[in-house]
């Protein structure tokens, strides 16, 4: 039977992720550094702007990917480049925290997109 | 060393359906998912599509207008890759391929499988 | 989707010239872009990730750069075993894409 047309990662199960990978975590893919982001100018985009550039850490590899997949979803999401602080730059768990503590408030919020 | 092992080369009818094999060795089969590419004889890279092992999560190109479906066996670390309706247009070397460096770039590929369709 | 168009489609060189193929994004991908090489009868084999960085064991001769829409695969001296095909790859979006390839040989 023909396979369905492929579901975008939820909201619920990009909290899972960020949830279980950052549980019991002191620190992520080394300690790596990353530039930190606005999340309010598009979170999905903004947060994969600044994690697409860390790589050899398979603990994010499905955060990035859900949030490859929720951002591809956005009317012209390549074409925005969202506000980034050139100036800042945090740890990886940091910015997942961030991130997490933002998509925690946008789901109790209700406003998915 | 990882290793993607692929199955052997199918000749189908068309409107038959073909289900190409990717076994693997080598590295831990849940941690990464595996993607498939196809490429038809003398032309580019097409991307298919990706199924993480470790949930069963999937994404699709939609160019194959949900003709592809991807499975993945945990126990045998096997991943497979089924093409319904298939017709001429879909005569290409069908590869497997893993990203662990970088996400969703293939570092490691299978020694590809040919899928012909004639009646 | 997002449309990657490589040029040249071919090119013809000389042992140690200097090879320079682009690959242009129908739009921002930011640094999301990565180099394949494949010989006849091969699977491709990724020389470059996030558009500059070189997988272990690629020669230092091939380097990329690049950034937003625009991006190069430089061979600083063109051996005789790099003679192939190569293709681009953006893995911002989903799908991801592939340009249509460059043809290079020896001439």
């Known amino acids: 039977s023909p396979s369905p047309v492929t579901p975008s990662p939820t909201l619920k199960e990009l909290i899972e992720e960020l949830v279980n990978i950052t549980q019991n975590q002191a620190s992520l893919c080394n300690g790596s550094m990353v530039w930190s982001v606005n999340l309010t100018a598009g979170m999905y985009c903004a947060a994969l702007e600044s994690l697409i550039n860390v790589s050899d850490c398979s603990a994010i590899q499905r955060t990035q990917r859900m949030l490859k997949a929720l951002c591809s979803q956005k009317p012209a999401a390549g074409q925005i480049s969202s506000e980034r602080s050139r100036d800042t730059k945090i740890e990886v768990i940091q910015l997942v925290k961030n991130l997490l503590t933002y998509v925690r408030g946008v789901y109790r919020h209700g406003n998915f997109r | 060393e990882v290793q993607l092992v692929q199955s052997g080369a199918e000749v189908k009818k068309p409107g038959a359906s073909v289900k190409v094999s990717c076994k693997t060795s080598g590295y831990t089969f849940i941690d990464y998912p595996m993607y498939w590419v196809r490429q038809a004889p003398g032309a580019g890279l097409e991307w298919m599509g990706y199924i993480d092992p470790y949930n069963g999560a999937t994404s699709y190109n939609q160019n194959f207008k949900g003709r592809v479906t991807l499975t993945a066996d945990k126990s045998t670390s096997t991943a497979y890759m089924e093409l319904s309706s298939l017709r001429a247009g879909d005569i290409a070397v069908y590869y497997c391929?893993?990203?662990?460096?970088?996400?969703?770039?293939?570092?490691?590929w299978g020694q590809g499988t040919l899928v012909t369709v004639s009646s | 989707e997002i449309v990657l168009t490589q040029s040249p489609a071919s090119l013809s060189l000389s042992q140690e010239e200097r090879v320079t193929i682009t690959c242009k994004a129908s739009?921002?991908?930011?640094?999301?872009v990565a180099w394949f090489q494949q010989k006849p009868g091969q699977a491709p084999k990724a020389l470059i990730y996030l558009a500059s960085n070189r997988y272990t064991g690629v020669p230092s001769r091939f380097s990329g750069s690049g950034s937003g829409t625009d991006f190069t695969l430089t061979i600083s001296s063109l051996e005789p075993e790099d003679v192939a095909d190569y293709f681009c790859?953006?893995?911002?979006?989903?799908?991801?894409?592939f340009g249509a390839g460059t043809k290079v040989e020896l001439k």
């Open positions: 391929a893993t990203a662990v460096v970088a996400t969703d770039v293939m570092e490691n």
């Open positions: 790859l953006q893995h911002w979006n989903y799908p991801l894409t």
């Open positions: 739009q921002n991908v930011r640094n999301a």
